[in-house]
């Protein structure tokens, strides 16, 4: 039985040109995390494998930095980065847990006055 739950940073906003940390936290399970996939809609951003470390998709290599921990840092944000992001935790023996984050990238002045849930 899958007992775990995923907490995420939820809905977040950041300003164009800035950076943001995407984080998910798996709790309430003793299952071993074997791999975490980060995806944007249906596009793979990065994989963090317990035995092989990080793999960043070539198309994102210049704008994505792994960490902290199993999180992912997006840099040089553009308005095209607005959208849904998913953390997919592969665990043993539980199976797969998925968390969702919605990121809105705003023009600088808008983000300054209207940003909620922003990670510094």
């Amino acid at each position: 039985m899958m007992t775990g739950t995923i907490e995420t940073t939820g809905n977040i906003s950041a300003e164009k040109g800035g950076s943001i940390i995407l984080q998910c936290h798996l709790s309430s399970t003793t299952a071993q995390v074997t791999q975490v996939n980060w995806e944007q809609q249906d596009q793979l951003l990065a994989i963090c494998n317990a035995d092989l470390g990080w793999h960043i998709s070539p198309s994102f290599k210049d704008r994505v930095a792994p960490g902290p921990g199993l999180g992912l840092t997006l840099q040089s944000l553009t308005v095209n980065d607005t959208g849904e992001y998913f953390c997919i935790y592969h665990t043993y023996p539980d199976g797969t847990y998925t968390g969702r984050i919605f990121l809105e990238v705003l023009e600088s002045s808008v983000a300054e006055h209207g940003a909620r849930f922003q990670i510094p």
């Epitope: 092989l52 470390g53 990080w54 930095a65």
Partner: antibody, heavy 117, light 107 residues
Framework: EVQLQQSGTVLARPGASVKMSCKTS????????MHWVKQRPGQGLEWIGA????????RYNQKFKGKAKLTAVTSANTAYMELSSLTNEDSAVYYC??????????WGQGTSVTVSS | DIVLTQSPATLSVTPGDSVSLSCRAS??????LHWYQQNSHESPRLLIK???QSISGIPSRFSGSGSGTDFTLSINSVETEDFGLYFC?????????FGGGTRLEIN
């Protein structure tokens, strides 16, 4: 077997700079953060910073900005840390350690630095 | 920066005893907490990752628990090779930080 081999003991004068190395083997160097940790005699562990050789991203403890500079040469599977403007406070053992998102799972044997006039 | 406070600073025990070491974070770090052991004149060694996940090659007498701000490393029936220093470390946010350590010594 994963190995992190650090350079040998260093004796340096106050005001000088030292550059130590951490040569890795048997894993994909560009897939893991390389962390550097300071330990003064009889003391705890202090995180200095980390570099991700995959794209040269670096993160620093604010306390060590301007003191430590982290670099990595992927062709040699080797990470480096340079310490500048040395003082007695910099006398310590410095460890390199890799992290692939699941804790600092492998550590070097440490490089001992002694600053003395 | 996140501050990790370990207690007690020193713990004197007899081989065969079971012990608990505490690590408290200054703010919630979810389960992003790892435990290390350091024996005299050796490099640290990863014992537990993400608060409770076991590490290959580490004896099963070591276990971890906790979430949020309060974490515990338990050693069930201490053996002589377990004496040394124990550190917790968080990977919730940059900069990573370590606790001040707990020294486990023979009573």
């Amino acid at each position: 077997e994963v190995q992190l081999q650090q350079s040998g003991t260093v004796l340096a004068r106050p005001g000088a700079s030292v550059k130590m190395s951490c040569k890795t083997s048997d894993y994909s160097f560009t897939s893991y953060w390389m962390h550097w940790v300071k330990q003064r005699p009889g003391q705890g562990l202090e995180w200095i910073g980390a570099i991700y050789p995959g794209n040269s991203a670096a993160r620093y403890n604010q306390k060590f900005k301007g003191k430590a500079k982290l670099t990595a040469v992927t062709s040699a599977n080797t990470a480096y840390m340079e310490l500048s403007s040395l003082t007695n406070e910099d006398s310590a053992v410095y460890y390199c350690s890799r992290e692939g998102g699941y804790g600092l799972d492998y550590w070097g044997q440490g490089t001992s630095v002694t600053v003395s006039s | 920066d996140i501050v990790l406070t370990q207690s007690p600073a020193t713990l004197s025990v007899t081989p065969g005893d079971s012990v608990s070491l505490s690590c408290r974070a200054s703010q919630s770090i979810y389960n992003n907490l790892h435990w290390y052991q350091q024996n005299s004149h050796e490099s640290p060694r990863l014992l537990i990752k993400y608060a409770s996940q076991s590490i290959s090659g580490i004896p099963s007498r070591f276990s971890g628990s906790g979430s949020g701000t309060d974490f515990t490393l338990s050693i069930n029936s201490v053996e002589t090779e377990d004496f040394g220093l124990y550190f917790c470390q968080q990977s919730n946010s940059w900069p990573y930080t370590f606790g001040g350590g707990t020294r486990l010594e023979i009573n």
